[in-house]
């Protein structure tokens, strides 16, 4: 074993280094002391450390560790934060476009429906936005509400425009008839399937990204245990007590200490890997009816086709509904 | 046929137009994100090594510190002695992860479960019950063109519309992101960087 270098007879070097850590010299001994009160940097002979210095070293060691973790995660953290924000914003833009396209379709094809249609379309897409952000809304209910609201307007404005004002309180009956008579054919069901599948996937995608931020933040701000703090202090700072300012920890020793300090954090590894691979699988499947951009931006066309379907069957429907809703004041059809 | 907003299509036939190759779409942006995330797949297993490589560790020096004394870098004592009579490393490992880590592991398990159940098995994009309800199997094979079921004039192709980077209402800046000002700069009176 190599002989240790001669100890610093005055603790001068230790003092000048420690002053940078903690301005004020009152904690550093003038000359080496026995150090019997030390709990971490257990001396083999005289030492230039005091109990107070040891506590300061522990604090600094844990702080170093936290800062190293933060620098390790900096790029990853920004990547997820930035993308979570970008995708959330992008999804909102998709919803806004989809609403504008649908409104434009009504304005240009069915101007007589516009004031009310705009209102119902607006409510529908507001619900879509809320659902993506995690709101507890049922997608089927959203779609049903859209078609339930639209049908009375279509009936009174397109199919039966000559209806006297006194007959306008048949709306409730018309809403009920809409479902029972499958007025819009299979279009509502089709839209439900497409919208619910694409929005579910979008919602979980955003949830996953937000959890990713939480995972990184958790490890970023980990508070290390006292035991870990003592091990880090021993590794990084106890050599200073012997005046060995330029000596570095052995590589293998560092690895052992880190495995001890970070055993808990490393347990995340398995689930983190699975998270990335599962997210990749989800993303690979986000196309066609599982792609909200695709589904929502094509919705105006499907809604248009559904109205055309109603118009095509207008004669038959008007007769049936005329009978069904003739006495709607006396009985609610539902 | 439906009126298509002017900035979207001239008429329905335009929908058959091929996908613009370099158009920045949400799906391409998602794929890009996944590829970037895959760079960090070993993040947690590599953390201990990162800390050691970013803190002072004897590399070229003959002597190094093992927690108790100076030793030769390649000696048996280099990894072992510093741990003796001090803290039981096994005990430290056995304590299990911090409650906050256990909590995040539980959340990861949950989201992984959700992601798996939501993932679409390849080649099963159009559900069977949908096929039975008015989907027609048209010429919908292109990867780049997305299909939406329609009725009347059959399957139609809708091109991904968003050149969404250009559409973003703001230019996202790191400094605006909460919790992102964690640059490793200690307080003036706290010198916590290492001195080599």
């Amino acid at each position: 074993q190599p002989p240790p270098p001669p100890p610093d007879a005055t603790c001068h070097q230790v003092r000048s280094f420690f002053q940078r850590l903690q301005p004020g010299l009152k904690w550093v001994p003038e000359t080496p002391v026995p150090g019997s009160d030390l709990q971490v940097c257990l001396p083999k002979g005289p030492t230039c450390c005091s109990r107070k210095m040891e506590e300061k070293y522990q604090l600094t060691a844990r702080l170093n560790m936290e800062q190293l973790l933060q620098s390790a995660s900096m790029e990853l953290k920004f990547l997820i934060i930035q993308n979570a924000a970008v995708f959330q914003e992008a999804f909102e833009i998709v919803v806004r476009h989809a609403k504008n396209y649908t409104n434009a379709m009504f304005k240009n094809n069915y101007p007589s429906l516009t004031p009310q249609a705009f209102e119902f379309v607006g409510e529908f897409f507001t619900d879509v936005s809320l659902y993506i952000l995690g709101s507890d809304i049922n997608v089927d209910d959203m779609v049903n509400e859209l078609f339930d609201s639209l049908f009375p307007v279509i009936y009174t404005q397109l199919m039966n425009p000559g209806l006297p004002d006194s007959a306008l309180d048949i709306n409730e009956c018309l809403r009920g008839a809409r479902r029972d008579l499958k007025v819009f054919g299979n279009f509502p069901k089709l839209i439900m399937t497409q919208v619910s599948k694409s929005l579910q996937v979008t919602r979980i995608f955003l949830q996953a990204l937000n959890l990713g931020i939480e995972v990184i933040n958790t490890t970023d701000h980990l508070k290390f245990s006292k035991d870990c703090g003592r091990m880090l202090t021993r590794m990084w700072y106890c050599s200073y007590c012997q005046g060995l300012m330029m000596v570095k920890p052995c590589g293998g020793y560092c690895n052992v200490v880190m495995q001890g300090c970070m055993a808990g954090v490393v347990e995340i590894d398995k689930y983190w890997r699975e998270y990335i691979l599962s997210l990749e699988e989800l993303v690979n499947g986000m196309y066609r009816i599982y792609d909200m951009e695709n589904v929502l931006l094509g919705l105006f066309s499907t809604i248009h086709d559904s109205i055309q379907y109603v118009q095509k069957n207008a004669g038959k429907l008007t007769t049936t509904i005329g009978k069904l809703c003739a006495h709607s004041q006396q009985r609610q059809y539902r | 046929s439906a009126y298509y907003p002017e900035d979207l299509f001239i008429d329905k036939k335009v929908l058959k137009v091929a996908h613009v190759e370099h158009e920045e779409t949400l799906s391409s942006r998602r794929r890009e994100l996944i590829q970037k995330l895959k760079s960090f797949i070993s993040f947690y297993s590599a953390l201990p090594g990162y800390i050691c490589s970013h803190s002072p560790v004897a590399e070229n020096d003959t002597l190094c510190w093992n927690g108790q004394e100076l030793v030769e870098r390649y000696s048996q004592k280099a990894a072992r002695n510093g741990m003796k009579n001090q803290f039981n490393l096994h005990e430290l490992k056995m304590k299990g992860p911090e409650p906050v880590v256990s909590q995040i592991i539980d959340k990861l398990k949950h989201i992984n479960q959700l992601l798996r159940t939501m993932s679409v098995p390849k080649g099963r994009v159009l559900d069977k019950n949908l096929d039975e309800e008015g989907f027609e199997s048209g010429d919908c094979g292109d990867d780049e063109d997305e299909c939406i079921g329609g009725s009347g004039d059959g399957m139609m192709k809708v091109k991904n519309q968003l050149r969404f980077l250009a559409e973003l209402a703001y230019d996202l800046d790191v400094d605006d992101v909460p919790g992102n000002n964690q640059q490793a700069t200690p307080k003036d009176n706290e010198i916590s960087t290492f001195h080599n």
């Epitope: 990853l76 920004f78 930035q82 | 590829q35 895959k38």
Partner: antibody
Framework: QVQLQQSGPELVKPGASVKISCKAS????????MNWVKQRPGKGLEWIGR????????NYNGRFKGKATLTVDKSSSTAYMQLSSLTSEDSAVYFC????????????WGQGTTLTVSS | DIQMTQSPSSLSASLGGKVTITCKAS??????IAWYQHKPGKGPRLLIH???TLQPGIPSRFSGSGSGRDYSFSISNLEPEDIATYYC????????FGGGTKLEIK
């Protein structure tokens, strides 16, 4: 520690193909992107493409599509780049470089393989 | 594709002095820029990633800064072993290198 050992220099005829190898050690080969970079004599660096050994996912610089084909052999932790229909323009030093674990930048590089295309 | 314009293409400086190299991206690259030192016959060496984060073992004489499209890299207190060609690399959208800067000592 991370090491990337590339195959030796190659002298090939125009029109032929060549396969350059890059053997990785000191890290989990399957979990990091492997990139390839070209440097023509007296010129700068040009990114060719990358492959993710875990699942074979690839990206190419448009200029090298059809020219370079990237593959891996996970059992030997080796990445390969095949260059086809060689011309004098392909004479260059080719580097393999690992995508980092804490950064997406290229953090470790091979020593380079010199390819000379000449008749 | 993102283009990276690096300047100057060569520069000469005195030992102990300071040099600065700049890179301008054709679009915002979100701080995803790295700087490399390349010496003949060797593979490039990563000095800095994510604009300003030093790789382990790289002296603090090397530094980087910037945001958006504009980035810079500096070496202070120049030493003889700093003679090399330096490259920037954007990695926000795949990868693009700058044209390189050849550093010579006066």
């Amino acid at each position: 520690q991370v090491q990337l050992q590339q195959s030796g220099p190659e002298l090939v005829k125009p029109g032929a193909s060549v396969k350059i190898s890059c053997k990785a050690s000191g890290y989990a080969f399957s979990s990091s992107w492997m990139n390839w970079v070209k440097q023509r004599p007296g010129k700068g660096l040009e990114w060719i493409g990358r492959i993710y050994p875990g699942d074979g996912d690839t990206n190419y610089n448009g200029r090298f599509k059809g020219k370079a084909t990237l593959t891996v052999d996970k059992s030997s932790s080796t990445a390969y780049m095949q260059l086809s229909s060689l011309t004098s323009e392909d004479s260059a030093v080719y580097f393999c470089a690992r995508g980092g674990v804490f950064t997406m930048a290229l953090d470790h590089w091979g020593q380079g393989t010199t390819l000379t295309v000449s008749s | 594709d993102i283009q990276m314009t690096q300047s100057p293409s060569s520069l000469s400086a005195s030992l102990g002095g300071k040099v600065t190299i700049t890179c301008k991206a054709s679009q915002d690259i979100n701080k995803y820029i790295a700087w490399y030192q390349h010496k003949p016959g060797k593979g490039p060496r990563l000095l800095i990633h994510y604009t300003s984060t030093l790789q382990p073992g790289i002296p603090s004489r090397f530094s980087g800064s910037g945001s958006g499209r504009d980035y810079s890299f500096s070496i202070s207190n120049l030493e003889p072993e700093d003679i090399a060609t330096y490259y920037c690399l954007q990695y926000d959208n795949l990868f693009t290198f700058g044209g390189g800067t050849k550093l010579e000592i006066k």
